[in-house]
Amino acid sequence: TQHGIRLPLRSGLGGAPLGLRLPRETDEEPEEPGRRGSFVEMVDNLRGKSGQGYYVEMTVGSPPQTLNILVDTGSSNFAVGAAPHPFLHRYYQRQLSSTYRDLRKGVYVPYTQGKWEGELGTDLVSIPHGPNVTVRANIAAITESDKFFINGSNWEGILGLAYAEIARPDDSLEPFFDSLVKQTHVPNLFSLQLCGAGFPLNQSEVLASVGGSMIIGGIDHSLYTGSLWYTPIRREWYYEVIIVRVEINGQDLKMDCKEYNYDKSIVDSGTTNLRLPKKVFEAAVKSIKAASSTEKFPDGFWLGEQLVCWQAGTTPWNIFPVISLYLMGEVTNQSFRITILPQQYLRPVEDVATSQDDCYKFAISQSSTGTVMGAVIMEGFYVVFDRARKRIGFAVSACHVHDEFRTAAVEGPFVTLDMEDCGYNIPQTDESTLMTGRA
């Protein structure tokens, strides 16, 4: 998971809306694993912004040491700064905790750019604005890092919420959420509402602002509108899903759907952008350029490098298309689509022009490791990570940024055949090579 910008074929597939409406599972099933309704104590417990990550306050050790921790569904280690670093205001001091236990084992996590390394241990952990429980969890005490912590981000560690298979140094290191569910009565489910501001926030505004909610153990109805639609978790490592069709302003990209998931598609709160496989990225950008052709932008903008600015309040949202991703549904031959607006994929950037300008970066980028549905996607939706039932739910977020003409949407069902063929089967090579490529 990166914290800046991270990220034999069969044709004729795809989820064209055929008019046929299949019966849809209601989202009010009695056997729902998580508590439903109101989680007042957890609402608004996240702060941050898409470009630097969303974080939750956690306490570690006895007496409790308070730290801000990045919420990352694209990794599986709970790792915290445990030594002085120029970008950290505070760090975990193991020697001050009476409940710290050293596991006498090191951990090293390299990324395409940057890395962190540290020492493994366990300690007591709680989430003040979360469930009223304390758990003993594995902690990687980060002693050295390079290009990992972000200056001004205000977080000091990372909470990897994915599965044990991608934990470091190996899958025997139990992730935090597994420990939480095992040691308490918290249901095996969490949900995220990431709220993009729609405008740049300076440091003090981020500290004062609400960034969203992480509801641990359930679903809060106040955080979304409409219905929740679920897609199966294909495999429990990353939160892997299957995309069956992609549309730009309703126009099908018409690619073999395997391309959309080459070599995987994941939901990752620790990545800023919507990252797409090379072929898909090129087709998508070509289509977005064509849709917005009344204005031209330099190549550096489409590469996510240059910013484009408009006079404050004059951003021409209407010239940019909506993007729809069709996801495999829970019912055979049924899919649903999630649609994001330019308000999600044009990311506001601060401190570059004058206050009379609104400036943006293009937040869709190329990936060599598959599709990554990062913060720009998640900011449009309330996303339910229903681990108990091996599925991920999407509903329109109550806090998503939109205008008077268009809104993000979650719609279905659509008839889509042969969706299983859209998944890519990664050749079983040394697993360690799969998890370091975070380009």
């Epitope: 009344t294 204005e295 550096g300 903008f301 240059q306 600015c309 401190d351 570059v352 400036c359």
Partner: antibody
């Protein structure tokens, strides 16, 4: 070979509107490869970007000029124009029209410039 | 706002000498920077784009380097026609709007 030529009055009274035209010769203003822009330079001072236009009519303006600027294009005449309203002596400058090339990034071809003096 | 600061304001050199001009951005502009030359009574001329690429027809004695916040224009051996004012411009923020204040290269 493509050339740009500014034209318009060299003297404008305070509070009036400055109007300049840039004629493109040796090539089409309707090329999808370029934006067209205006830059000015007060006597003895540095360069200040005023704004750009694409042949479709899409415009970008310098916010510091506070809504006084209008740039328009006439593809049939292969021209684009600048209007700057409510001028003061501070608007006295050499006004250049230029082509924004190299992937819409750099002013790679300039007109000779025309001096506009704001004075009563 | 990104501010471009050029130094020195004036550089006094003799023909044949090496000229080194600096442009510093108040924050990173990646490699999205250009250099222009302006002679008295003339329009500016694009010399270098994308920090280090020479524009069409620009002699090899002109070279640009740098990325991020610090950029340099080097004229390896000054010719008489090189005495002029040089401006840098960033296009990291688009449309391109910010010019540096200029460096005057004068005959010593």
């Amino acid at each position: 070979q493509l050339q740009l030529q500014e034209s318009g009055p060299g003297l404008v009274k305070p509070s009036e509107t400055l109007s300049l035209t840039c004629t493109v010769s040796g090539g089409s203003i309707s090329s999808s490869s370029y934006y067209w822009g205006w830059i000015r330079q007060p006597p003895g001072k540095g360069l200040e970007w005023i704004g750009n236009i694409y042949y479709s009519g899409s415009t970008y303006y310098n916010p510091s000029l506070k809504g006084r600027v209008t740039i328009s294009v006439d593809t049939s005449k292969n021209q684009f124009s600048l209007k700057l309203s409510s001028v003061t002596a501070a608007d006295t400058a050499v006004y250049y029209c230029a082509r924004l090339g190299h992937g819409y990034n750099y002013f790679d071809l300039w007109g000779r410039g025309t001096l506009v003096t704001v004075s009563s | 706002e990104i501010v471009l600061t050029q130094s020195p304001a004036t550089l006094s050199l003799s023909p044949g000498e090496r000229a080194t001009l600096s442009c510093r951005a108040s924050q990173s502009v990646s490699s999205y920077l250009a250099w222009f030359q302006q002679k008295p009574g003339q329009a500016p001329r694009l010399l270098i784009y994308d920090a280090s690429n020479r524009a069409t027809g620009i002699p090899a004695r002109f070279s640009g380097s740098g990325s991020g916040t610090d950029f340099t224009l080097t004229i390896s051996s000054l010719e008489p026609e090189d005495f002029a004012v040089y401006y840098c411009q960033q296009v990291y923020v688009w449309p391109p709007r910010t010019f540096g204040g200029g460096t005057k290269v004068e005959i010593k």
